[in-house]
Interface confidence: medium
């Protein structure tokens, strides 16, 4: 009967590839008599004439290859591989990740605005959303000179963290211990990906006990 | 058609920098990363570090780290890459790729270049 | 960080077969994708995913890649196959391309 010749390498079961690239699903297997190989899509027979673009079937290589993957491609794609001692199948799933980046998105009613006693802890709360890394920034409004803003009209901020996020969807902390009447005032929380700019503005009133 | 078309020769003097630019076209830009490989006079390809046009990642191979700035204007599907300090070794032609990732059920996600640039001269010369 | 290892030059007589080798520690479990490169051109792509050629590029290029050495065969070469020809790996655990120092294919006579 077939067998597959490298099962320890068919374990991903799960392509997720963003739209415009290319996909190869290989099943490589041996078997006496040598068996043949075919394609499903959704339980169905697949062939070149199923999609834009075709299909490139390698029979020696137990490959099938898609170039410039698109939505409609998502499913299920099973090999087949038989002789007349039998046949053994693989299912893997595509999944085509359509790329419509938007500019980062900070999830309503945070940061919340807070008033603190002197001395004690406050920790305020950013929730940020981007399919595109984003570079997330805490800052506050400062003076310089006495003056709120620059020659150019802009305000005058320090940057108080910066980093950038690994994930989609990000939640982000900024603590201050022990709060002096020096850490009243605005702050901003910012996220920047190359499609734009979101930013959130805050404040903090500090009071004596 | 999908073409990459690169800045014209540039002279340039040690210790100055270099900005070459690739204006993509016939392809959605924001579909594919772009590559940037240097060939000296004579010698094989060197690959200098690529750009998500995607989401503005970067990566730089190792040799070239604090010296080389890969950016996009997705505006106007151009790639750029800046090279600072230059030195007469850094004399090359400079290629811009368009990147398309592989992704393969069994050895996983590769990335080559399927679409170059015509290449750009750099002379670095007192 | 792979390093890709290529015989500097290749002597072939018009059709005859051309066999270019790149050698790397387990490359086979990688891979590879070649380059051809004429005098004063860009490169350009003739094989990906070790054995998949791209639209415009004969089927007389073939590649193959098993154990520590990738190949990539040229049937009845002509001399317009004259160039130089690259591999390149994706090393996923940098995130960085790697080339090969390339082969210079002459075609004789």
């Known amino acids: 009967a077939p067998y597959w010749t490298r099962p320890e390498r068919m374990d991903k079961k799960l392509l997720a590839v963003p739209a415009a690239n290319t996909v190869r699903f290989a099943c490589p297997a041996a078997g006496n008599p040598t068996p043949s190989i075919s394609w499903l899509k959704n339980g169905r027979e697949f062939r070149g004439e199923h999609r834009i673009g075709g299909i490139k079937l390698r029979h020696q290589q137990w490959s099938l290859v898609m170039e410039s993957v698109v939505p409609s491609d998502r499913g299920n794609y099973t090999c087949v591989v038989e002789n007349k001692f039998g046949s053994i199948r693989q299912t893997y799933t595509l999944d085509v990740l359509e790329r419509s980046p938007h500019r980062p998105i900070l999830q309503a009613g945070l940061p919340a605005n807070q008033t603190a006693v002197l001395g004690s802890d406050v920790e305020f709360h950013c929730k940020v959303y981007s399919d595109a890394q984003p570079h997330i920034q805490w800052l506050k409004h400062v003076e310089v000179n006495g003056s709120k803003v620059g020659p150019d009209g802009t305000p005058y901020v320090t940057v108080l963290k910066s980093w950038i996020s690994e994930s989609v969807e990000a939640d982000v902390r900024l603590r201050l211990a022990n709060v002096s009447e020096r850490d009243g005032g605005e702050y901003l929380c910012r996220a920047t990906n190359f499609i734009g700019v979101a930013e959130k503005a805050f404040w903090l009133s500090v009071h004596g006990p | 058609e999908v073409q990459l078309v690169q800045s014209g020769a540039e002279v340039k003097k040690p210790g100055a920098s270099v900005k070459v630019s690739c204006k993509a076209s016939?392809?959605?830009?924001?579909?594919?990363?772009i590559s940037w490989v240097r060939q000296a006079p004579g010698q094989g390809l060197e690959w200098m570090g690529w750009?998500?046009?995607?989401?503005?990642?970067?990566n730089y191979a190792q040799k070239f780290q604090g010296r080389v700035t890969v950016t996009t204007d997705t505006s106007t599907s151009t790639a750029y890459m800046e090279l600072r300090s230059l030195r007469s070794e850094d004399t090359a032609v400079y290629y811009c790729?368009?990147?398309?990732?592989?992704?393969?059920?069994?050895?996983?996600?590769?990335?080559?270049?399927?679409?170059w640039g015509q290449g750009t001269t750099v002379t670095v010369s007192s | 960080q792979s390093v890709l290892t290529q015989p500097p030059s290749l002597s072939v007589a018009p059709g005859k077969t051309a066999t270019f080798t790149c050698g790397g520690n387990n490359i086979g479990d990688k891979s590879v994708h070649w380059y051809r490169q004429k005098p004063g051109q860009a490169p350009v792509l003739v094989m990906y995913?070790?054995?998949e050629r791209p639209s415009g590029i004969p089927e007389r290029m073939s590649g193959s890649n098993f154990g520590n050495t990738a190949t990539l065969t040229i049937t009845r070469v002509e001399a317009e196959d004259e160039a130089d020809y690259y591999c390149?790996?994706?090393?996923?655990?940098?995130?960085?391309?790697?080339f090969g120092g390339g082969t210079k294919l002459t075609v004789l006579g």
């Open positions: 016939g392809y959605m830009f924001t579909s594919y990363g």
């Open positions: 790729a368009r990147v398309l990732g592989y992704y393969d059920s069994i050895d996983g996600y590769y990335y080559g270049m399927d679409v």
């Open positions: 750009v998500s046009t995607y989401n503005g990642d970067t």
């Open positions: 995913l070790d054995t």
């Open positions: 390149q790996v994706w090393d996923s655990g940098s995130d960085h391309v790697v």
